[in-house]
């Protein structure tokens, strides 16, 4: 996977008037890693690797950095004209992505009220609008006013890319994103299902990178997918990700059936437990 | 390549007790379970039992149960097969395989021939 | 325990001819079916598992197949490398059941 850095930036009006302040997150490689915070008006590193990454460096260039995002987009909302009474927001996604072989991918994305009316390549400065008439009108109201704004020149687009992949690059040195692995905590529970039955369900949780293998085996193989249940790999909000991997198994047979669990080049296996309450965990 | 060598041909006395051993290599021991099967002499053959290496954990084939221990060693990356109370008719072949997590007994040992006689 | 009857116990083919050897489960095992290939001096190789699933490095002319509780092998066309003993497994239900095997040899 590639190496990336999202700003999430929102900004919200009432009745017309667009509220001070602004809500923004900053997610690198996918985990949660910096926000704003409203009260302090700074940068705060979202959890202990986050701070690693740019060690006894303070997070001014991150305040500054999003504080001038979190005006622009201010301003911005100020000039859409369809704004109803009521709340409304408007959000813009910026990510910038360094691939494997040193390719680079930028854009930006507005949505208003959570709905997306405008999408821009920040490297070849296409806009993409989706069909629907409300964000057509909506995507022509922005790039109106973005065009008179003096500061979203061509350049401006350019630094914005420039920009995102300097501060990703500059994370990516500390060396602490790429050098770090996580074993995950695994853990297999299980439940009453229909009658004969239980639902064994193996959960491994704060684990980085984000790629694992979770699977049932029984008798040491594999089940095939259709007899399985996978959950998504989320992040868990340290830093780290957490998924699960269910399957139903007739009461009794239990000890046929293992939760294999394979990451960043170890692995481990996980019996059910016997009883109804006993929960094994096991960090590997 | 998967290769399981197991320890060479014993000879025991009825009542007495005999370890056969499995030794894996060109792979990682603790990935995949071992399984112990046994051929008496113009016989089919018959499984004893499996071990997961990365617990321990053992299921056996309630005929082999008190007869049969499994265990590994995983520093050196061998499973093994303790016989106990030997009579006659424990004298087989008897072949440890593993597998790939796709099919059971997908890789075989040589066998080892456990005669038992007085 | 699910008794595994393996047909027929011994045949004789001659190089090229299409051979057939059928394991008969006692009850139904889901496909869960693998074929093994026993030489004297060697290693038993696992030929196909899961009914049809051919083991990889396996040549082709091994094919499997069947359900419920009738299962066949089935060498397409018999090469002088083929004569060995050949068994099933059910890993369906515990304990795991062999059939008896079937010697096959060249006429």
């Known amino acids: 996977e590639p190496h990336s850095l999202r700003y999430n930036l929102t900004v919200l009006s009432w009745d017309g008037s667009v509220q001070s302040g602004f809500l923004a997150e900053v997610h690198l490689d996918g985990q949660p890693f910096l926000r704003y915070d409203r009260q302090k008006c700074r940068a705060k590193p979202q959890g202990q690797w986050a701070e690693d990454v740019l060690g006894n460096k303070t997070w001014d260039r991150e305040t500054r950095d999003l504080t001038g995002n979190g005006k622009d987009l201010r301003m911005t909302l100020a000039h859409i004209k369809d704004q109803k009474e009521g709340l409304h927001s408007l959000q813009e996604i910026r990510v910038c992505e360094i691939h494997e072989d040193n390719s680079t991918r930028s854009s930006q994305h507005f949505y208003y009220d959570g709905e997306l009316f405008l999408s821009q390549n920040l490297e070849t400065e296409e806009w993409t609008v989706p069909q629907s008439s409300r964000a057509q009108t909506l995507a022509m109201n922005v790039r109106n006013f973005l065009k008179e704004d003096a500061m979203k020149t061509k350049t401006h687009y350019h630094a914005m890319h420039a920009d995102c992949l300097q501060e990703l690059r500059r994370y990516l040195e500390s060396g602490v994103v790429l050098r770090r692995t996580v074993p995950p905590m695994v853990n297999v529970t299980r439940s009453e299902a229909s009658e004969g039955n239980i639902t064994v369900t193996c959960r491994a949780s704060s684990f980085y990178p984000r790629n694992i293998i979770l699977t049932w085996r029984q008798d040491g193989v594999s089940l095939s997918h259709d007899t399985q249940q996978w959950g998504d790999v989320l992040p868990d909000g340290n830093g780290t990700y957490q998924t699960w991997v269910a399957t139903r198994i007739c009461r009794g047979e239990e000890q046929r059936f293992t939760c294999y669990m394979e990451h960043s080049g170890n692995h481990s296996t996980h019996p059910v437990p016997s009883g109804k309450v006993l929960v094994l965990q096991s960090h590997w | 390549q998967v290769q399981l060598v197991q320890s060479g041909a014993e000879v025991k006395k009825p009542g007495a007790s005999v370890k056969v051993s499995c030794k894996a290599s060109g792979y990682a021991f603790t990935k995949y379970n071992f399984y112990w099967v046994r051929q008496a002499p113009g016989q089919g053959l018959e499984w004893i039992g499996y071990i997961d290496p990365y617990f321990g954990g053992t299921v056996y084939n309630q005929k082999f149960k008190g007869k049969a221990t499994l265990t590994v060693d995983k520093s050196t990356s061998t499973a093994y097969m303790e016989l106990r109370s030997l009579r006659s008719d424990d004298t087989a072949v008897y072949y440890c395989?593993?597998?790939?997590?796709?099919?059971?007994?997908?890789?075989w040992g040589q066998g080892t021939l456990v005669t038992v006689s007085s | 325990d699910i008794q595994m009857t393996q047909s027929p116990s011994s045949l004789s083919a001659s190089v090229g001819d299409r051979v057939t050897i059928t394991c008969r489960a006692s009850q139904d095992i889901s496909n869960y079916l693998n074929w093994y290939q026993q030489t004297p001096g060697k290693a038993v190789k696992l030929l196909i598992y899961y009914t049809s699933r051919l083991h990889s490095g396996v040549p082709s002319r091994f094919s499997g197949s069947g359900s419920g509780t009738d299962y066949t092998l089935t060498i397409s066309s018999l090469q002088p490398e083929d004569i060995a003993t050949y068994f099933c497994?059910?890993?369906?239900?515990?304990?795991?059941?062999f059939g008896q095997g079937t010697k096959l040899e060249i006429k």
């Open positions: 395989a593993t597998t790939d997590a796709y099919s059971l007994f997908t890789y």
């Open positions: 497994l059910q890993g369906n239900t515990l304990p795991f059941t």
